[in-house]
């Protein structure tokens, strides 16, 4: 099996969960 390492250039050491809804629901069909 392979192993790879990724490094982000973002300087913050705390992952930001702010890009995702806190209590998401499923998309409704229109």
């Amino acid at each position: 099996s392979e192993t790879t390492t990724g490094t982000s250039s973002n300087s913050s050491q705390s992952t930001s969960n702010s890009g995702l809804a806190p209590n998401p629901t499923n998309a409704t069909t229109k």
């Epitope: 705390s14 992952t15 930001s16 969960n17 890009g19 995702l20 809804a21 629901t25």
Partner: antibody, heavy 115, light 112 residues
Amino acid sequence: EVKFEESGGGLVQPGGSIKLSCAASGVTFSEAWMDWVRQSPEKGLEWVAEIRDKTKNYVTYYAESVKGRFTISRDDSKGRVYLQMNNLRTEDTGIYYCTGAMDYWGQGTSVTVSS
Amino acid sequence: DIVMTQTPLSLSVTIGQPASISCKSSQSLLYSNGKTYLNWLQQRPGQSPKRLIYQVSKLDPGIPDRFSGSGSETDFTLKISRVEAEDLGIYYCMQGTYLPWTFGGGTKLEIK
């Protein structure tokens, strides 16, 4: 320095199983919502699964295409998130990225499902 | 599922010139808390994606202010005020309002 190190990828036959692992360092892992996202030439970027933190009771979410076949889990004491992939299909082939809520990303590990 | 449609598919820009990418969602991405969970990601050749912008217009740490995001509801735009050589790659919009999270098909930025 934030690093996400993925491992476990490889070649597997249709119907087979594989377990991916992602080790995080340099980040407050226990607070992170962790996702697996895959990428293929056919489907582009495709979200697979997510596990939230203790404050969210480690709730999990899955894409419909993997529900019942894949299981996401985490070990906060080790700073690791896992993706157990069962009953694999050829369409599961791709590069699997571990990401902290789309913020930090690993370099990806390749999974090929083929006979 | 929410469909994210990006235009153009590709664009070629001279260094120092501006660039603009459009992203349209099939439903409003406005969440009940008043926030809109629209992200922009950059993927340089041979690299993994990197988030540039979250919640429509908020820049991630370390991202140059040449990048900016705008829009609301279903129509969003990523702008680069002055393109630099390091900006080449594929840009994706991604929505985090409704499950499943979905991505646009990408816009390839080439340097003239």
